[in-house]
């Protein structure tokens, strides 16, 4: 806290420019309107005021908006977003991309705040939706925001922000995020023709159920390992030596290489070594040939 | 990386003026404050002033304010500081720096430094 | 003006001692103080800002100390190339000022 001292003879601040840099915090204090500052505040960002002077600066805003910043003021933060805490966000009605843009900005290059947190969280709810122009900014400004999200909060975003989404931007995405997610990516690529479908697809394909990997593996594909080893066990599993054979395409030797890895090896366990045997890799751990395979789970199905 | 290029060293006369200048290049030029340190042997750092290269915006030390000049040509990306009326006391190694976050003014990067040397 | 005095123009050691360079600001600065080593012919390089963060690449037996008006930096286990010029730099308000330097020289 600065402690209330008066503006000596001839400082008082007229408007917001650089000789204030030179200002000591109690002359700040005493010298600066808070009114002038908060019309002026375009030109703040301007001047290379130093952290302990920014404390200054936020101490007369706070001052002068108790409820929270207006949008006219927020938008021209610039590096004094810095010295807001969580609680001075929540206050705050941010409903401009531009603002948004704006804050991100200052703080980009560094790990995602509490601060900017908070802002994002803001923002969003005041929109009710993650539109494809939000998905757009946040996910250039933070790669891996989607994988933040719980699958709740990601279940308001449109298929058509999918559109948006980079292959990088979902690689801390946990299975039930891409269950979320790929229902809504199955729908936005939906009138893609095949080949760029599969590009389009690939990333989301952590979230695919069964029927569209069989889907899949009819149309040439040639799925590679590394998309293939995300896929969901139980999605994988019921697939056929074929279809998997057809899912990869040239790819199919790399199955070797990971055996002992789910899903592979829970696949292996399920097929017959005979059909295995058909691959030519040496794949072992399949069901050997004159075993009767009961699938208990359908005859539960039928009691 | 950043580099920012200085020449090793100038000689001047009394009374004559002197245009020392400073090359940026590994970052982009226009974003960051360029600011300008002089040391004398045996003696401290003085911070002089800082240009900001998009905006032309100057910023001196009062002490400096009629002995230095800070200009930017944004196509070469170079920053000049031009002495004037120089005298022995202006006989110094000159310093550019950048700041990369202005909220906090500590000298990320330091050109190598221009000796000058002022004598008759 | 802020005024940062470094009060030991020298200080002598020996390469695997223990030495701390000591800076005192006229007014309360915070944390915001930077310390620059320099060498024989080369520019100041950042060694540690908001007086204990060490900048990148910076070997952890530099470490810097203290708030308000007292700073001080200490090298533990000193290597011979360790021995220069140490600044240090009030970032609390402008105009940015340093103190005159201590020189770390051999016994």
């Known amino acids: 806290e600065v402690e209330k001292t008066a503006c000596p003879s001839g400082k008082k601040a007229r408007e917001i420019d650089e000789s204030l840099i030179f200002y000591k915090k109690w002359e700040l204090e005493a010298c600066v309107d808070a009114a002038l500052l908060a019309t002026q505040m375009d030109r703040v960002n301007a001047i290379p005021f130093t952290y302990e002077q920014l404390d200054v600066l936020k101490h007369k805003l706070d001052e002068l908006y108790p409820q929270g910043y207006p949008e006219s003021v927020i938008q021209h933060l610039g590096y004094l977003f810095l010295k807001m805490s969580p609680e001075d966000i929540r206050k705050w009605n941010v409903t401009s991309l531009e603002t948004l843009k704006a804050l991100l900005e200052v703080n980009k290059g560094h790990e995602m705040s509490p601060q900017v947190a908070t802002l994002i969280d803001r923002f969003v709810k005041g929109r009710g939706q993650l539109d494809k122009d939000t998905l757009d900014t946040l996910t250039a400004f933070y790669p891996g925001y989607l994988c933040s999200l719980s699958p709740e909060e990601l279940s308001s975003v449109p298929p058509s922000s999918i559109w948006a989404v980079r292959p990088q931007d979902l690689d801390t995405c946990d299975p039930r995020q891409l269950d979320v997610l790929y229902p809504k990516a199955r729908l936005a690529f939906q009138n893609m023709n095949g080949s760029e479908y599969f590009v389009k697809i690939q990333s989301f394909l952590g979230g695919a159920p069964t029927e569209d990997l069989k889907a899949l593996s009819q149309q040439n594909v040639s799925m590679d390992l590394a998309t293939f080893m995300k896929l969901r066990t139980d999605a994988v599993l019921p697939l056929t030596v074929a279809e998997v054979q057809k899912l990869l395409g040239p790819h199919v030797e790399g199955l070797k290489a990971e055996e002992r890895h789910r899903p592979v090896r829970d696949w292996i366990l399920r097929q017959r070594q005979d059909d295995l045997d058909t691959l030519g890799l040496g794949l072992q751990g399949g069901i050997p040939n004159g075993y009767l395979v009961l699938d208990l789970s359908m005859q539960e199905a039928l009691s | 990386q950043v580099q920012l290029q200085q020449p090793g060293a100038e000689l001047v006369k009394p009374g004559a003026s002197m245009k020392l200048s400073c090359k940026a290049s590994?970052?982009?030029?226009?974003?960051?404050?360029m600011h300008w340190v002089k040391q004398r042997p045996g003696q401290g750092l003085e911070w002089i002033g800082m240009i900001h290269p998009n905006s032309d915006n100057t910023i001196y030390y009062e002490k400096f304010k009629s002995k230095a000049t800070l200009t930017v040509d944004k196509s070469s990306s170079t920053a000049y500081m031009q002495l004037s009326s120089l005298t022995s006391e202006d006989s110094a190694v000159y310093y550019c720096?950048?700041?990369?976050?202005?909220?906090?003014?500590?000298?990320?990067?330091w050109g190598q430094g221009t000796t000058l040397t002022v004598s008759s | 003006d802020i005024v940062m005095t470094q009060s030991h123009q020298f200080m002598s050691t020996s390469v695997g001692d223990r030495v701390s360079v000591t800076c005192k600001a006229s007014?309360?600065?915070?944390?915001?103080v930077a310390w620059y080593q320099q060498k024989p012919g080369q520019s100041p390089k950042l060694l540690i800002y908001w007086a204990s963060t060490r900048h990148t690449g910076v070997p952890d037996r530099f470490t810097g100390s203290g708030s308000g008006t007292d700073f001080t930096l200490t090298i533990s286990n000193v290597q011979s190339e360790d021995l220069a010029d140490y600044f240090c730099?009030?970032?609390?308000?402008?105009?940015?000022?340093f103190g005159a330097g201590t020189k770390l020289e051999l016994k």
């Open positions: 720096a950048i700041i990369i976050t202005p909220v906090v003014p500590k000298f990320d990067y």
């Open positions: 590994g970052y982009t030029f226009t974003s960051y404050w």
């Open positions: 007014h309360d600065v915070g944390t915001s």
């Open positions: 730099q009030q970032y609390s308000s402008y105009p940015l000022t």
